[in-house]
Interface confidence: medium
């Protein structure tokens, strides 16, 4: 089946059950339900999934059976609306159940919570986990899907199946190892970090589709696929973009069965046509389905074809530029983006999209001018500052990162961003700045040619986290402006923000800077977060504090924690020395 072909199935639920198989069907329905009803207990979801699965089996046996002709949204929505505690647990989300499809599904989507009030996942002891895995492997793995899906309501469902497969493999291998912990813990850490990154990347795709529309997503996909598959024909890239857009539209819209099915079809198509797509796909295409799809999504860029002609001939020098543009604007701009991107694997996707936007704006203006060619002849000169801006920014920040190391680089960004948008909640500023700071270790090690696509496209993902968290509780007009005006200019918009002079400093609260002995038992990462939380609060109290003042206070704070954690009576030390530290900090900062 091609990704486009939608056969006339009497029963959509039977069709998807047969295509995906029972195991994947059940897993995807569980993910879908957990992403919609994020507060429901695990057991309730399992019960709903089993009911849906039994119903699907009756439809497989007889597609004409009662209700088998209903849409998946109708079937799933009806099932979700049977939850007895919907009103108490979810409040106004229960009003969705009074609506008809498709409004009901749209209503459920609007109530997805990017920051649900759920307890942090605490990892049990390795022996406890291994026992649970051996006692009931199926429940153990379902619980993993459930816990990830409810905390990440936009997680790319078919990719979560891939993570679950790796999660299972880790326990299968390590629970038999001599040193279970040494085997398992690094694997779980890796899955956790990769999972967070995967969730954030998918969240940007969904935001792109939902906030800026299909055209914005397609432009992103043309640029990225053209960089990845520079030998592929424009026709080929266009086909892949259309199919990929359909897959992500489905997943972002909660149509997880269709999404997973279409993603499998797309992987199959790519592998059947790899000769005309990329020479780098061979290894991916030999893998089983979930690994194959993941591998294709991460595949390295193919080599650029030799002797690509100058872009100027078709897009600046040709007498036909305005005619070509007028006859098929999006196709012509798509070709421009394709040709530019395949020649520039060294540019970020967002930079390529800025260049395409500049080119489009120039043609809009010039094709209405008296002498169009004269007007657009220098359009490529306008690209120079757009290219240099991220290049310079990355160079400066990588130098700073190399000088400071990750933790202190994160702190520099914490101060920078707190001064730009001090109204944003402290936990959000800490989370976002820590992630922004990770760009250093992630990208600065790369050679020049790989730095920009690594850094700027990663920053787009992180800033989208800020945007979706801020959207839930908007507190800053500046954040709203940068987040909503232009998807591709978000990073330059935030970079351009200066200190917010309108901000009224927060009242000093000694409680914010009171610490206890429990800090001594925290992991290094959690201790860093405590210190970084204090740093943000300091800046909110004293936004005009200099780097030197803040550094002095933070150094004193680090020494205070180290001293009291070594003390015999830790709690007394924290109480007494803490008061002295607060007083000294107030004096140092003039509070």
């Amino acid at each position: 089946r091609g990704v486009f072909r939608r056969d006339a199935h009497k029963s959509e639920v039977a069709h998807r059950f047969k295509d995906l198989g029972e195991e994947n069907f059940k897993a995807l329905v569980l993910i879908a339900f957990a992403q919609y009803l994020q507060q429901c207990p695990f057991e309730d979801h399992v019960k709903l999934v089993n009911e849906v699965t039994e119903f699907a089996k009756t439809c497989v046996a007889d597609e004409s059976a009662e209700n088998c002709d209903k849409s998946l949204h109708t079937l799933f929505g009806d099932k979700l609306c049977t939850v007895a505690t919907l009103r108490e647990t979810y409040g106004e989300m229960a009003d969705c159940c009074a609506k008809q499809e498709p409004e009901r599904n749209e209503c459920f989507l609007q109530h997805k919570d990017d920051n649900p009030n759920l307890p942090r996942l605490v990892r049990p002891e390795v022996d406890v986990m291994c026992t649970a895995f051996h006692d009931n492997e199926e429940t153990f793995l379902k619980k993993y899907l459930y816990e990830i899906a409810r905390r990440h309501p936009y997680f790319y469902a078919p990719e979560l199946l891939f993570f679950a497969k790796r999660y299972k493999a880790a326990f299968t291998e390590c629970c038999q190892a001599a040193d279970k912990a040494a085997c398992l813990l690094p694997k779980l850490d890796e899955l956790r970090d990769e999972g967070k990154a995967s969730s954030a990347k998918q969240r940007l795709k969904c935001a792109s589709l939902q906030k800026f529309g299909e055209r914005a997503f397609k432009a992103w996909a043309v640029a990225r696929l053209s960089q990845r598959f520079p030998k592929a024909e424009f026709a080929e890239v266009s086909k892949l973009v259309t199919d990929l857009t359909k897959v992500h539209t489905e997943c972002c819209h909660g149509d997880l069965l269709e999404c997973a099915d279409d993603r499998a079809d797309l992987a199959k198509y790519i592998c059947e046509n790899q000769d005309s797509i990329s020479s780098k796909l061979k290894e991916c295409c030999e893998k089983p389905l979930l690994e194959k799809s993941h591998c294709i999504a991460e595949v390295e860029n193919d080599e650029m074809p030799a002797d690509l002609p100058s872009l100027a001939a078709d897009f600046v020098e040709s007498k036909d530029v305005c005619k070509n543009y007028a006859e098929a604007k999006d196709v012509f701009l798509g070709m421009f983006l394709y040709e530019y991107a395949r020649r520039h694997p060294d540019y970020s996707v967002v930079l390529l999209l800025r260049l395409a936007k500049t080119y489009e704006t120039t043609l809009e203006k010039c094709c209405a001018a008296a002498d169009p060619h004269e007007c657009y002849a220098k359009v490529f000169d306008e690209f120079k500052p757009l290219v240099e801006e991220p290049q310079n920014l990355i160079k400066q920040n990588c130098e700073l990162f190399e000088q400071l190391g990750e933790y202190k680089f994160q702190n520099a960004l914490l101060v920078r961003y707190t001064k730009k948008v001090p109204q944003v909640s402290t936990p959000t500023l800490v989370e976002v700045s820590r992630n922004l700071g990770k760009v250093g270790s992630k990208c600065c090690k790369h050679p020049e040619a790989k730095r920009m696509p690594c850094a700027e496209d990663y920053l787009s993902v992180v800033l989208n986290q800020l945007c979706v968290l801020h959207e839930k509780t908007p507190v800053s007009d500046r954040v709203t402006k940068c987040c909503t005006e232009s998807l591709v200019n978000r990073r330059p918009c935030f970079s351009a923000l200066e200190v917010d002079e309108t901000y009224v400093p927060k009242e000093f609260n000694a409680e914010t800077f009171t610490f206890h002995a429990d800090i001594c038992t925290l992991s290094e990462k959690e201790r860093q977060i405590k210190k970084q939380t204090a740093l943000v609060e300091l800046v909110k109290h004293k936004p005009k504090a200099t780097k030197e003042q803040l550094k002095a206070v933070m150094d004193d704070f680090a020494a205070f924690v180290e001293k009291c954690c070594k003390a015999d009576d830790k709690e007394t030390c924290f109480a007494e020395e803490g008061k002295k530290l607060v007083a000294a900090s107030q004096a140092a900062l003039g509070l």
């Epitope: 030998k231 024909e233 080929e236 005309s276 078709d314 036909d320 196709v331 070709m335």
Partner: nanobody
């Protein structure tokens, strides 16, 4: 979906002629420059000739200048390559592409063999 279908290849003696066609569909054909590309077994594709959207600007690789002629019929959404004075070294698979890309289209090319 965008599609390009090449035809017209075959076996011809040195000095002979062939006319290749490329039928295009799924996009605004007259809006785009088109090219012919050839590929020898195991080698990178090689650009042969290009024509702009209107059909009044043509370009050729030095190796085919004076022997090959590119043209198009926008009403029929078809691109042509008239090949005269063929030489054994013109033996290759030929295919058309959109723009000036030398990248391989998904469609089958058309094989040209020049041999006595």
């Amino acid at each position: 979906a965008v599609q390009l279908v090449d035809s017209g290849g075959g076996l011809v003696q040195p000095g002979g002629s062939l006319r290749l066609s490329c039928a295009a569909s799924g996009f605004s054909f007259g809006s785009f420059g088109m090219s012919w590309v050839r590929q020898y077994p195991g080698k990178e594709p090689e650009w042969v000739s290009s024509i702009n959207g209107r059909g009044d600007d043509t370009r050729y690789a030095d190796s085919v200048k004076g022997r090959f002629s590119i043209s198009r019929d926008n009403a029929k959404n078809t691109l042509y390559l008239q090949m005269n004075s063929l030489k054994p070294e013109d033996t290759a698979e030929y295919y058309c592409t959109i723009g000036r890309s030398v990248s391989r289209s998904r469609t089958q090319g058309t094989q040209v063999t020049v041999s006595s």
